[in-house]
Amino acid sequence: SQVSQNCHNGSYEISVLMMGNSAFAEPLKNLEDAVNEGLEIVRGRLQNAGLNVTVNATFMYSDGLIHNSGDCRSSTCEGLDLLRKISNAQRMGCVLIGPSCTYSTFQMYLDTELSYPMISAGSFGLSCDYKETLTRLMSPARKLMYFLVNFWKTNDLPFKTYSWSTSYVYKNGTETEDCFWYLNALEASVSYFSHELGFKVVLRQDKEFQDILMDHNRKSNVIIMCGGPEFLYKLKGDRAVAEDIVIILVDLFNDQYFEDNVTAPDYMKNVLVLTLSPGNSLLNSSFSRNLSPTKRDFALAYLNGILLFGHMLKIFLENGENITTPKFAHAFRNLTFEGYDGPVTLDDWGDVDSTMVLLYTSVDTKKYKVLLTYDTHVNKTYPVDMSPTFTWKNSKLPNDITGRGPQ
């Protein structure tokens, strides 16, 4: 049913869904802090623009009686329950921030007349692609897929002279929410990644993964997995690995690799880590001081969601346009706004663009070094280290199929 929005006469409200089931196990208090910090910034920006309006957030908590797993598995109905609660209380804001779980976002989008914008810190799955009023502020699976296909095809860099067309994907079902949907997208038979590869097999057991590392009859030298170095170590340990194996470790929301005193453990030498370019000012900011690197990105997405709303509100108010219109609901895309840590770009479908960074372990220094970066907005690779000190032969990434001749 149509819910009246608290969104006019100089008073603009943001509805923040505080769900028990979340993409990251982040205390709701930290998310509240992030939202409140965002509100302070927005108020300042509006004031500086000469717009004398009130902006507030209403935090909508679920009762947690039914949906209490804490992760995203039981989130499908929680979002709808919260929307019902909002509807009954007639407390809908101009914009909805949350949910972060793909299941709940998909269901909410499907089952409601969305005449208001929805901003999500998460909703990584392909099922949340191309939604007209949904904005996602953490890299969705589609962006990862485009990078991987681009990288697989690359054969004109001095350190990658073979195009790849094969891969193993390790997916054992215990992944975090982001990893679950990233790997799900790679596994999906109809996805762009599957379409572009000639061979792809999903490894679901630890033993399958461990066997492949030294299997002379393996069908690919490349294994994609998702998680941190510790996750890899638990699986791989100190097992011997064939010299032409390449493990691609997707660990987007973890900036520990860039910390000065970090040394790469020996088991990371056959690994390329895919992560996001770290923010500059986050480490010392008030809202992120007590957060782990991963949770920093999650809380930052909430904060940036508030700043995005402030950006759009400012534009519409300056143009004398109504906020409670489909035009406003559909406007949260194809733009760049000033985020907490610099400019944030959203693509034509409201998904955040970012700089992905591919790291390798230098055999000389045992440090993580940047191999290349990839701008998801223009789908362009920027080589960084043209002569990497790889563990692989001739300082080149191997062919993906053992024994195949030069390309």
Partner: antibody, heavy 118, light 106 residues
Framework: EVQLVQSGAEVKKPGASVKVSCKAS????????MNWVKQAPGQRLEWMGV????????NYNQKFKDKATITRDTSASTAYMELSSLRSEDTAVYYC???????????WGQGTTVTVSS | DIQLTQSPSFLSASPGDRVTITCSAS?????MYWYQQKPGSSPKSWIY???NLASGVPSRFSGSGSGTEYTLTISSLQPEDFATYYC?????????FGGGTKVEIK
């Protein structure tokens, strides 16, 4: 438009050092690698090294590892190459050249002539 | 290092002629890059990734080849095409250049 403007010609005595600059404009300096290329009279072009201005990563051609030192000043969008212990065989035109992968060396500076003579 | 050998080193031709320059690599490379240089000027990117014309390069130029043999072809030579052309590889580190082919007016 993209421009790479190099410092002027230099005449140096053997054993001296010289620092050549390359000021970039018309694009984001930190987005593209910067190469240095030598062209000695009557010789083929020789690639000396490359620097990534964003991360500071530098790769040298082994042949020039002890001859050239590449640096940058990102605030001034300028790349530098210093040549040490100059000898007559270092007499050449030195070019900076930007990468726009996959088009390597897509824009070149006008060149800096370094003459080493006693 | 990969050696690149260009042939011929010198080439005399008349406007309207079809001209082919060859670049042979000492080992197989995936792509070849070409540059044009006129006297007193810096080199210009001309063809990248074997066959892609750089911005502003006329369509009478084309590039082809694979493995160790690559060619740059000018279908109908124009007065402004008289210059030296260099091939270059970045398949192996370090990148290397050919010795150049000077195209002169007959």
């Amino acid at each position: 438009e993209v421009q790479l403007v190099q410092s002027g010609a230099e005449v140096k005595k053997p054993g001296a050092s010289v620092k050549v600059s390359c000021k970039a404009s018309g694009y984001t300096f930190t987005d593209h690698n910067m190469n240095w290329v030598k062209q000695a009279p009557g010789q083929r072009l020789e690639w000396m090294g490359v620097m990534n201005p964003k991360f500071g990563t530098i790769n040298y051609n082994q042949k020039f590892k002890d001859k050239a030192t590449i640096t940058r000043d990102t605030s001034a969008s300028t790349a530098y190459m210093e040549l040490s212990s100059l000898r007559s065989e270092d007499t050449a035109v030195y070019y900076c050249a930007r990468d726009d992968y996959p088009n390597y060396f897509d824009y070149w500076g006008q060149g800096t002539t370094v003459t080493v003579s006693s | 290092d990969i050696q690149l050998t260009q042939s011929p080193s010198f080439l005399s031709a008349s406007p309207g002629d079809r001209v082919t320059i060859t670049c042979s690599a000492s080992s197989s490379v995936n792509y070849m890059y070409w540059y044009q240089q006129k006297p007193g000027s810096s080199p210009k990117s001309w063809i990248y990734r074997t066959s892609n014309l750089a911005s502003g390069v006329p369509s009478r130029f084309s590039g082809s080849g694979s493995g160790t043999e690559y060619t740059l072809t000018i279908s109908s030579l124009q007065p402004e095409d008289f210059a030296t052309y260099y091939c270059q590889q970045y398949h192996d580190y370090p990148p290397t250049f050919g010795g150049g082919t000077k195209v002169e007016i007959k």
